[in-house]
């Protein structure tokens, strides 16, 4: 006869491990008992359980309520046992010793491998700002047994580097993603992908990139010269910029206070019916937490009654 078993039994943490040991013998042979032992390089061989054909399953107190026979129907030649709720400390070598009649004793050893699936965590790097050099965008750490694989999935151009730390029963892997921040990266997803034999599918954690920037400011509204004549209504100046975080706008007049009746509404400066009093240099000040920009324009309101004056519109930033 011979024993049918496995060299390696692999189970995920918390699952039940079936330790197989089946005696394949002649029809007239019988199994008297199957003794299971844990083989420890330091502590030697320690009995785990004994499965006796007459006296039933005996379990070592250290494994009480954790070792069982597989559910019926059971073959009398099957000495397999179930180790409930596998933990990392269960990982190691096991031995089954089968006492048969009349063939004698047979033994086999197997290794129990307990997979510990990782629980990854993603940590964003310092705030990203346009104009910085190569900067840490995010790091992703996963610890498991065996060591997990940590990679990045993104359309963003960057570099990734990994390092691992080995512990007695697991390994922690940290991968960092570095990039040169630009405004085009704003809102782009950066996904950490963790692979491991204990996971049915990859674990993914997505971080949305935020890159702080502030665009140059410019003013629109002076394109149509006919709008800037005495008596005209609805004249506006609009300050154009964009940024992250979204910028705030402030309007001032360089050569004095804003004329009465001029209304500031965010990025837009609205004028009442125009008079020559509205002529002057107007400054749009754009700012966010990162930076500030200015753009100024010179407005000259033409009086159609004064043919000596031409409309002179000058814009400068």
């Amino acid at each position: 006869g011979e024993l049918e078993t496995s060299d390696v039994v692999t189970v995920v943490l918390g699952q039940d491990a079936k330790l197989p040991c089946f005696y394949r013998g002649d029809p007239d042979e019988q199994v008297g008992q199957v003794a299971w032992a844990r083989v420890d390089p330091n502590e030697g061989i320690r009995e785990l359980a004994l499965l006796h054909s007459k006296y039933g399953l005996h379990v070592n107190p250290a494994y009480e309520d954790r070792v069982e026979q597989p559910p019926p129907p059971r073959d009398p030649l099957d000495g397999s046992v179930l180790l409930r709720n596998a933990v990392q400390a269960d990982e190691g070598e096991y031995e089954c010793r089968v006492s048969t009649f009349p063939a004698g004793s047979f033994q086999a050893r197997m290794r129990l491998r307990v997979l510990v699936p990782p629980l990854p965590s993603l940590n964003p790097g310092p705030p990203l700002e346009e104009g910085q050099g190569l900067t840490l965008a995010a790091s992703c750490t996963a610890e498991g047994s065996p060591a997990p694989s940590v990679t990045w999935d993104t359309e963003v151009k960057g570099t990734q580097s990994s390092r691992s730390f080995t512990h007695p029963r697991s390994a922690a892997v940290t991968s960092e993603f570095h990039l040169v921040p630009s405004r085009s990266m704003n809102g782009q997803p950066l996904t950490c992908v963790v692979s491991h034999p204990g996971l049915l599918q990859d674990r993914r954690i997505t971080h949305t990139l935020q890159v702080a920037f502030l665009a140059e400011a410019s003013v629109r509204g002076l394109e149509d010269q006919n709008l800037w004549q005495v008596g005209r209504e609805g004249a506006t100046l609009k300050c154009l910029s964009e940024g992250q975080p979204p910028p705030k706008y402030n309007w001032t007049r360089l050569d004095g206070p804003l004329p009465s009746g001029v209304r500031v509404k965010g990025d837009t400066l609205g004028f009442p019916p125009l008079t020559t009093e509205h002529s002057g240099v107007y400054v749009c000040h754009v700012s966010n937490e990162l930076s500030s920009r200015d753009s100024q324009v010179t407005v000259e309101v033409l009086d159609p009654e004064d043919p000596g004056k031409q409309v002179d519109l000058v814009s400068a930033s």
Partner: nanobody, 117 residues
Framework: EVQLVESGGGLVQAGGFLRLSCAAS????????MGWYRQAPGKQRELVAG???????RLADSVKGRFTISRDNAKNTVYLQMNSLKPEDTAVYYC???????????WGQGTQVTVSS
């Protein structure tokens, strides 16, 4: 041959306790399986508890949480601690020892346990 001598039986009220001892004439460390069967009047003999040379144990479902089996290798003795005894535990308790796997077990002479309500 292994001689087994039991002691510790007696009459006890329900809820009480007894400790049975089974002294073997040779090292219990070398005995494959030792333990206790019981037989109540008019009933079949049933396995109550067992302990292996490697220290693994078995208790019948009917006594789990109430009985414990242990052994003292130095004294070549196996013990059955019986707590929270019930009238249905009344029986003759027999110590057994299977010296080598597959061999017929050796038996003690039996000790009477009576639990009164």
């Amino acid at each position: 041959e292994v001689q087994l001598v039991e002691s510790g039986g007696g009459l006890v009220q329900a809820g009480g306790f007894l400790r049975l001892s089974c002294a073997a004439s040779r090292s219990v460390f070398r005995i494959n399986v030792m333990g206790w069967y019981r037989q109540a009047p008019g009933k079949q003999r049933e396995l109550v508890a067992g302990i292996t040379s490697g220290g693994s144990r078995r208790l019948a479902d009917s006594v789990k949480g109430r009985f414990t089996i242990s052994r003292d290798n130095a004294k070549n003795t196996v013990y059955l601690q019986m707590n929270s005894l019930k009238p249905e535990d009344t029986a003759v308790y027999y110590c057994f020892a299977e010296a080598v796997v597959g061999d017929e077990p050796y038996w003690g002479q039996g000790t009477q346990v009576t639990v009164s309500s």
